[in-house]
């Protein structure tokens, strides 16, 4: 087909000789054809079309990529001749850097539905050259990691040695989609979530007297996990006193948040303090009530069949621990004013007497 009608874009890939890195070309079809063919999508007027014309709509065709030999030979089908170049929907992925990737790459829709569609193509002139080692010692890597749950940033490798003030305007893409919220050489992430991982592309324009080039770099971003540096955090009980009714059953819940640990051995127990005595209570098993990639909330309840007068003099302590340290929360029971009658009080005292006998014969105290 005649490529003279294709729109042209010039790109520069300055690769680091010290690292493995990838490169991506987008089939960035021109605006005039987008309305006719290249972007005949189901977007409503309020939706902003994606940077890539074909990725979203299933009935839009994929594209065909070609490489134009410098000697004027016929166009070559990328898939047949270049195993290190992968065609992925509307992108072309170069798995290995090298000056041999320099050349002209053409993309056009696979399906041509009308005479107008013939000109719906893009020619990308790619220049590939090694980055001078002297340019910057601490340039950002093409593989960057973000720690889950923390703050972080993604830096454009080709601009990471420049201050934000010096930096030209940058266009960012994530997994092929335009990120419109930042034009800086760094994307700042307030809290890292798993969805921040992906393939990021940063573009900026470099001009000389003769022409203008888009300098592009690709960054693979992973979200990673690391052991918490914090002790567990007791979410409940919040209050140190709890109003109760004598003679009635009572459940006190202890809920604690444990930060991520690769080897996770959480400890959660209830114990009771009574004067100078202290003992652990056998209570139902702890259960995980919420688990995310960065933390886990665990709950364990203490159950009193009937609240007694003695319970009012005791302190109930929830103890939680991880490999960093422990946290405790004490709860003192307080009788609800105006609750219960004489019968309740006699009943409670009878229970207390039975419990004293049972308590003295069964519990092993430790100080």
């Amino acid at each position: 087909f005649n490529i003279s009608g294709c729109s042209t874009k010039k790109l520069l890939w300055a690769y680091s000789t010290r690292s493995e890195e990838e490169f991506i070309l987008f089939c960035d079809l021109p605006e005039p054809q987008k309305s006719h063919f290249c972007h005949r999508s189901q977007l409503s007027p309020t939706q902003v079309p994606d940077h890539l014309p074909f990725t979203d709509s299933k009935d839009l065709p994929d594209v065909q990529w070609y490489r134009q030999p410098s000697n004027g030979d016929p166009l070559e089908d990328i898939r047949k001749s270049y195993p290190h170049i992968i065609q992925d929907k509307c992108t072309l992925r170069f798995l290995t850097p090298g000056v041999n990737n320099t050349g002209s790459y053409i993309c056009r829709p696979k399906m041509i539905k009308s005479p107008y569609d013939v000109a719906c193509c893009v020619k990308m002139i790619l220049e590939v050259k090694p980055q001078s080692n002297a340019s910057c010692e601490n340039s950002a890597s093409h593989k960057q990691d973000l720690l889950l749950g923390s703050t972080g940033s993604i830096s454009c490798p080709s601009l990471s040695c420049q201050s934000d003030a010096q930096s030209p305007e940058v266009t960012w893409y994530k997994n092929g989609k335009l990120l419109s919220m930042t034009r800086s050489n760094r994307i700042v992430v307030d809290e890292v979530y798993i969805y921040h991982q992906g393939t990021y592309v940063c573009d900026y324009t470099q001009s000389d007297t003769a022409s203008s080039w888009t300098v592009r770099a690709v960054v693979q971003v992973r979200t990673i996990v690391g052991d918490t540096k914090l002790k567990p955090d007791i979410l409940d009980p919040v209050e140190s006193t709890l109003e109760v009714e004598l003679g009635k059953p009572l459940t006190i819940s202890c809920k604690a948040r444990f930060g991520f640990e690769r080897v996770f051995n959480p400890v959660m127990k209830w114990y009771i303090k009574d004067a100078d005595l202290e003992w652990e209570v056998s209570v139902p098993e702890a259960k995980s009530i919420k688990s995310t990639l960065k933390d886990e909330i665990i709950e364990r309840n203490i159950i009193l069949e009937k609240v007694t007068q003695r319970d009012l003099r005791r302190t109930f302590v929830c103890f939680v621990q991880n490999s960093i340290g422990n946290t405790t929360q004490s709860v003192q029971l307080k009788e609800k004013r105006g609750s219960g009658g004489l019968n309740d009080i006699f009943e409670a005292q009878k229970i207390e007497w039975h419990e004293t006998v049972r308590f003295q014969s069964h519990h092993h105290h430790h100080h």
């Epitope: 798993i194 992973r222 052991d227």
Partner: antibody, heavy 124, light 107 residues
């Protein structure tokens, strides 16, 4: 690009303590786990243990009584000490960055960057 | 400790061949498996994590599959640089363990 370099004596006498250091360059020691792995001549790989940059450790039970791994974040280094060595501890010792990748709603650990290895011979 | 058994222990193949290496765990390890390539005198190089996720920069001719106890590493079309020893590794429980390795040689 992160690079790891092992250093330490290549020859250790039986019953003595083997000491190796791994220096991390081109990146931070923070936020990662750091492992030691060894490979006896002509054999497979054996994991010795890891340390998180904050100091949490986890050791292979078969070596636990003899192993200590420590970290010095100010120097971007972590170290291995293996006491009471015998000829069976002769191996190539590797240090590696051990990363927990959060993906597909789970965690996947992998040793993604390795040192080139250092040969340690235990002999009198 | 979880034992990983690789088969075959060694394998001869030609450039362009499709090769499959298997790794069997002594108990279920979900998808907590990684694959490494090691060349003589060199450190292992990581290829695949989570049983099937390819590390960026690793050629797409490498692929991993499996879950539970049975896993495979496939090289769709062998290249000269692929001749090496391959190890599987489990991270499901401690201690972390490796398979005994599969040596891939040129026929």
């Amino acid at each position: 690009q992160v690079q790891l370099q092992e250093s330490g004596p290549g020859l250790v006498k039986p019953s003595e303590t083997l000491s190796l250091t791994c220096t991390v360059s081109g990146g931070s020691i923070n936020n990662y786990y750091w492992s030691w792995i060894r490979q006896p001549p002509g054999k497979g790989l054996e994991w010795i243990g890891y340390i998180f940059y904050s100091g949490t450790t986890n050791y292979n039970p078969s070596l636990k009584s003899r192993v200590t791994i420590s970290v010095d974040t100010s120097k971007n280094q972590f170290s291995l000490k293996l006491s009471s060595v015998t000829a069976a501890d002769t191996a190539v010792y590797y240090c590696a960055r051990d990363v927990g990748i959060a993906a597909r709603n789970s965690y996947y650990y992998v040793m993604d960057v390795w040192g080139q290895g250092t040969t340690v011979t235990v002999s009198s | 400790a979880i034992q990983l058994t690789q088969s075959p222990s060694s394998l001869s193949a030609s450039v362009g061949d499709r090769v499959t290496i298997t790794c069997r765990a002594s108990q279920g390890i979900s998808s907590a498996l990684a694959w490494y390539q090691q060349k003589p005198g060199k450190a292992p190089k990581f290829l695949i994590y989570g049983a099937s996720s390819l590390e960026s920069g690793v050629p797409s001719r490498f692929s991993g599959s499996g879950s539970g106890t049975d896993f495979t590493l496939t090289i769709s079309s062998l290249q000269p640089e692929d001749f090496a020893t391959y190890y599987c590794q489990q991270f499901n429980s401690y201690p972390i363990t490796f398979g005994q390795g599969t040596r891939l040689e040129i026929k």
